[in-house]
């Protein structure tokens, strides 16, 4: 070993070196949180970049760059260090137009904390392992969601466009002439029934157990879907999103109430099945796989 390499190894294995890097990363993170950093922080940035460069140089000199089993680039954690340094120099010395987009990569510096703290490294390792094991469960989840999305598509396609429309139109107005002239939400409120505080027109349906319109209004299928058009079963992708919402129980009761009002109370069976299978079974299956992966990693 050359004297330079011996010195590099001594520095690399020293506990103070790890402490220095850890403190640098944490300080850097504090500086990154500043809203309007003063001018002098530019010099501090250069200091941080210098320390990271020094760290990487020490590692490269001690372990070698990429030829051989235990060299610098053979460790995935060092890829992160390498990317951080490359982007630090890129944003500083190369004019690449939209620098603000590249500056986003400075946030990767915070991730360096993982490689420095051993406990955190283990947890992240377990997380990566669990993701690998999750592939089968994910396939099952996507398959189940797809099946139910297709069922939802068949049952509820277009239903959430049903609205309560005002009967008492002007003598020569028609549904079409009105829809062509409606622009603002104010206009919509003139012709469609809105419950107090609601941002969407009252939903209704054509089956006996679906929601009915108040007196003076009739149920029509017109306009866009609720929630700015994002809530619907009109295409497979929207239906899939709705099913994902049910699975994650993300304000699912609103989707449930909207659909039941537009389609009929009978369809609660669909929601019961989806909540039981998707939300209770599949979510817990995912959690079980993650728990098993952590257990294996600990052993």
């Amino acid at each position: 070993f050359s004297p330079l390499r011996r010195i590099s190894i001594k520095i690399l294995v020293h506990s103070l070196f790890s402490m220095l890097i850890m403190c640098t990363i944490l300080t850097n993170c504090i500086f990154m949180t500043m809203n309007n950093p003063p001018d002098w922080t530019k010099n501090v940035e250069y200091t941080f970049t210098g320390i990271y460069t020094f760290e990487s140089l020490v590692k490269i000199l001690a372990r070698g760059f990429c030829v051989g089993e235990f060299t610098f680039l053979r460790d995935p954690w060092n890829w992160l260090d390498f990317v951080v340094i490359v982007f630090a120099y890129l944003t500083e010395f190369v004019n690449l137009g939209n620098v603000s987009a590249l500056r986003t990569f400075r946030v990767l510096r915070a991730l360096k904390t993982i490689s420095v703290i051993p406990g955190l490294k283990t947890i992240v390792g377990a997380l990566i392992q669990s993701v690998k094991k999750l592939s089968d469960v994910m396939i099952l989840t996507v398959f189940c969601l797809s099946v139910f999305a297709l069922i939802g598509l068949q049952l509820f396609m277009g239903n959430l466009k049903h609205k309560c429309f005002r009967n008492s139109l002007e003598n020569n107005e028609t549904l079409e002439s009105i829809m062509n002239t409606l622009e603002s939400e104010e206009d919509f409120r003139k012709y469609f029934y809105y419950l107090e505080g609601s941002k969407d027109a009252l939903l209704c349906g054509f089956s006996t157990d679906s929601g009915q319109c108040p007196e003076g209004y009739t149920c029509v299928k017109i306009g866009r879907n609720p929630d700015y058009g994002y809530t619907s079963f009109d295409t497979f992708s929207w239906a899939f999103l709705a099913l994902f919402r049910l699975m994650t129980q993300d304000y699912w009761e609103n989707l449930y109430q909207q659909t039941l009002r537009a389609a009929g109370k009978t369809y609660m069976i669909f929601f019961v099945v989806v909540i039981f299978l998707g939300s209770f079974y599949l979510i817990n299956l995912i959690l079980a796989v993650v728990a098993m992966a952590y257990e294996e990693q600990n052993q």
Partner: nanobody
Framework: EVQLVESGGGVVQPGGSLRLSCDAS????????MRWHRQGAGKQREFVAR???????DYADSVKGRFTISRDNAKNTVYLQMNSLRPEDTALYYC??????????????????WGQGTLVTVSS
């Protein structure tokens, strides 16, 4: 496809009566308002009477007290009972309705439909 068919038109003497009917056919789920309009020779189409799905009625000033609009929801039909007819009532009478129906492929469509018209002639 939704169709509106008017019937009951004909020639009648002034002061006489006629009953027009308009039948809506197709895979109808719901009919909102149903209206009668008329168009005299060389004139613009004008509103005559309207009835909503909850049977609220409205009439043009020129026919108030003489004409009565009614509907039979079970048959998807609207009627216009015309009494005390005058020569100025001579026109082609059109039926107009807001219909929500199940169309090809099972999807639902709402729209305003018109009939072909039935001719009413009031002359001595």
């Amino acid at each position: 496809e939704v169709q509106l068919v008017e019937s009951g038109g004909g020639v009648v003497q002034p002061g006489g009566s006629l009953r027009l009917s308009c039948d809506a056919s197709g895979r109808i789920l719901r009919i909102g308002y149903m209206r009668w309009h008329r168009q005299g020779a060389g004139k613009q189409r004008e509103f005559v009477a309207r009835i909503t799905d909850d049977s609220a009625t409205d009439y043009a000033d020129s026919v108030k007290g003489r004409f009565t609009i009614s509907r039979d929801n079970a048959k998807n039909t609207v009627y216009l009972q015309m009494n005390s007819l005058r020569p100025e009532d001579t026109a082609l009478y059109y039926c107009n309705a807001l219909v929500t129906a199940s169309v090809r492929g099972g999807s639902i469509h709402s729209g305003t439909y018109w009939g072909q018209g039935t001719l009413v002639t009031v002359s001595s």
